[in-house]
């Protein structure tokens, strides 16, 4: 069961896996959650009754029964991992710790104006896990305003000590705030021969890349496929690093694949969730249980529901045996990966889906869409909402996109003349406007946040957030869309769609059924040529056919320009303005969302 509260002055006895140092019990709980085996933890706070060398220790623990005996101990704080919980989990930690020095390898020292600047530097440095900043009140003159970037093998400090007039904190890479490039390519027939920090077994290069992404020291990887000539190295995933942060040595070698950590894109692609099944593949590991199951899907469910299960192998039933049920082997290992992978034995293997909640909800695959046609089908664009005003009468005002369980992203120009959020209603999971009746449930709007530099759509900053009064429960028909990663600025999107209930021609009416149109992106240079009287800035993005004919129109404003990249949908643009609708050589102009990711995160993550 899920226990979120912390137990003060309580220590769990036994079950120790490893000890790390964390600046708070709250962060110790996060570290425990992300550790492959940790189910419980005991943290020691600073206290006069405790030996200072034990302050800030976070002891990660495991137990077959999922609990351990409790002992009273002053300054000890204990709790359970969030593995047992169903809610979204994030490693993002924006806290700044005053008068704490988090020890690690100090590999970079520079002057910074503030702790915030130091944290930004850490976030944009490929090696940095955390930092310590000496404030201007620091006693030693030559160390004042010094920003020390640090890293360790585990990503957590090697020790934490009290030190006056310094502050420490963590990199915000896991908050999607890094400007580092996001390189998603996997390079076939390539070995990176740089330093190995670890090696694990993986069924394919994608899983290897995802393991690299959530390993604190891994910057890139090499994977040896099951056709690799050296049998003892098949399915081996080498996690690698280098001083420069890039591979220094690329060697052509058939049956090997290499790629990069997706740390800078982890908010828009799954990195923890290995959802595929591997046929004719057996995963070896410590056996947790053997259960009868009807199918490999049922076996995966059993593994997901067993909190200690990390992966499984299902052996289908022999004909007419055991009521058609096969054997489901639930397994675990010290690092969450199989200890060996064997092929040709007829098993079907896979991983627990428990870790999927550590990924952003927006990365969940949605059902296949209908190709062709202009009318959408239910669940095709589950992030699309219809924003209604109730004054003077109720009507569709604008589109919008779900980007979080309490947040809608839309256009600022939608709120011209809107005096209060009280007159707004957000309807999600809607296909036809005619579904909206008096008793249709909606989300009230608590707050409208308009970009403070917004004046008019044509001059940019046409972006607004709606904070909902209640949270959205994600389902197949209402779920969030991913924001583009800042590291993805150079991605060329080729599969982009605009959706909305807006007019189908300039003089028309709001459509009943949600419409969709596939529209190619247009370069800003090309777009500027089409709008000589306007300034097309880098904060805008354009889309449209040269010959016209397909475009967003009145009523689509605020809705999404959704682009699919690597199987995940991204909110690339917000429908903003254009000259007429679908006119020849007049592309639609959209707010370029990637340029506002910091603004969005600042507003939505504000405490």
């Amino acid at each position: 069961e899920c226990v979120t509260q912390l137990l003060k002055d309580t220590c769990f006895e036994g079950g120790d896996i490893t000890t790390v140092f964390t600046p708070s019990a709250k962060y110790c709980q996060v570290v425990c959650t992300y550790h492959p085996r940790c189910l419980l933890f005991t943290f020691t706070a600073e206290s006069p009754s405790e030996d200072p060398t034990r302050w800030f220790t976070c002891v990660l623990k495991d137990s077959v029964t999922e609990t351990l005996p409790r002992v009273n101990r002053t300054a000890a704080i204990s709790g359970y991992s969030f593995k047992q919980c169903s809610h979204q989990i994030s490693a993002c930690n924006k806290d700044i710790y005053v008068d704490l020095d988090m020890k690690g390898i100090n590999y970079n020292s520079s002057v910074a104006k503030s702790a915030q600047e130091c944290q930004e530097r850490c976030t944009d440095d490929v090696h940095c896990h955390f930092f310590t900043y000496a404030t201007r009140q620091f006693p030693s003159l030559e160390h004042r305003n010094i920003c020390l970037l640090k890293h360790t093998q585990t990503g957590t400090p090697t020790r934490i000590t009290k030190l006056d007039k310094v502050v420490s904190g963590f990199s915000l890479k896991s908050c999607a705030l890094s400007n580092l490039a996001c390189i998603r390519d996997i390079f076939p027939n390539t070995v990176f021969a740089d330093s190995n920090i670890d090696s694990v077994m993986a069924p394919d290069a994608f899983v290897c890349g995802r393991i690299c992404t959530h390993h604190p020291g891994c910057l890139f990887f090499t994977f040896f496929s099951q056709e690799w000539p050296k049998e003892s190295q098949r399915n081996l995933c080498l996690l690698k690093t280098s001083e420069s942060g890039l591979p220094s040595t690329r060697i052509k070698k058939s049956k090997a694949l290499s790629g990069f950590s997706l740390q800078s894109c982890r908010h828009s692609i799954p990195v923890f969730c290995h959802s595929s099944f591997y046929h004719d593949t057996d995963f070896l590991g410590e056996e947790l249980d053997i259960v009868a199951a009807k199918s490999h899907e049922a076996c995966q469910k059993l593994c997901t529901n067993a909190v200690r299960c990390q992966f499984f192998t299902y052996t289908p039933a022999q004909a007419s045996c055991n009521e058609g049920k096969g054997k489901c082997y639930l397994k675990l290992s010290s690092n969450g990966s199989p200890t060996k992978i064997l092929h040709g034995r007829g098993g079907i293997s896979g991983y627990t889906l428990r870790l999927c909640k550590m990924d952003n909800e927006c990365t969940t695959k949605i059902k296949p869409r209908i190709v062709g046609g202009t009318a959408s089908v239910r669940g095709e664009w589950p992030w699309q909402v219809t924003l209604h005003t109730t004054s003077p009468t109720q009507r569709h005002l604008c589109g919008g996109s779900i980007i979080g369980n309490q947040w809608i992203l839309t256009a600022a120009h939608c709120f011209y003349g809107v005096e209060s959020p009280k007159i707004l209603r957000v309807y999600s999971g809607i296909l036809n406007q005619s579904e909206i009746k008096e008793d249709t449930s909606f989300f009230g709007v608590q707050e409208i946040i308009i970009h403070d530099q917004y004046k008019m759509a044509e001059s940019g900053y046409d972006i607004a957030l709606l904070k909902l009064e209640t949270t959205v429960n994600y389902t197949d028909s209402q779920r969030p869309i991913c924001l583009p990663s800042k590291g993805d600025r150079n991605v060329i999107y080729t599969d982009c769609w605009v959706t909305g209930w807006g007019y189908r021609k300039l003089r028309d009416k709001i459509q009943n059924t949600l419409q969709k149109a596939k529209i190619p992106l247009v370069t800003n240079e090309e777009c500027q040529k089409r709008y000589r009287g306007h300034k097309i800035t880098h904060k805008m993005i354009c889309a449209g056919y040269r010959e016209g004919g397909k475009d967003a129109c009145k009523g689509d404003s605020g809705g999404p320009l959704s682009c699919k990249h690597n199987e995940v949908w991204h909110l690339v643009g917000i429908t903003s303005w254009g000259e007429g609708c679908a006119q020849r050589e007049r592309p639609g102009v959209y707010t370029n969302v990637v340029e506002y990711v910091d603004w969005i995160l600042e507003k939505t993550q504000a405490v």
């Epitope: 740089d194 330093s195 920090i197 090696s199 050296k230 190295q233 081996l236 052509k252």
Partner: nanobody
Framework: QVQLQESGGGSVQAGGSLRLSCTAS????????MAWYRQAPGNECELVST???????YYADSVKGRFTISQDNAKNTMYLQMNNLKPEDTAVYYC????????????????????WGQGTQVTVSS
Amino acid sequence: QVQLQESGGGSVQAGGSLRLSCTASEFTFDDSDMAWYRQAPGNECELVSTITSDGGTYYADSVKGRFTISQDNAKNTMYLQMNNLKPEDTAVYYCAADQWGSAEGDCTSSYPGGYWGQGTQVTVSS
């Protein structure tokens, strides 16, 4: 038990030459990727040169044009011909089999299926 044994190290003046050999026992070169690594005091282990099972070769930029890797499958031996040696080439040289990169910057720890020799010292004086 797989064993790799290096030989041919020694002291030499800058501009001089040395030829390192690596002989394998309980192990055949035919289907293996062989390499020379080196580690200077206080430095990380670095890849010097590789010869892959399909005959492809790789050289670190610092040794290109001066070092040549080769192997004699019949003798189960790999060689590194080092010409025009420089003081910065001073290091312990390690022979490795199926070892793509060092572990934690150290020329001794391997992952499954990878092997290291004991190393041979090369000292180049100016």
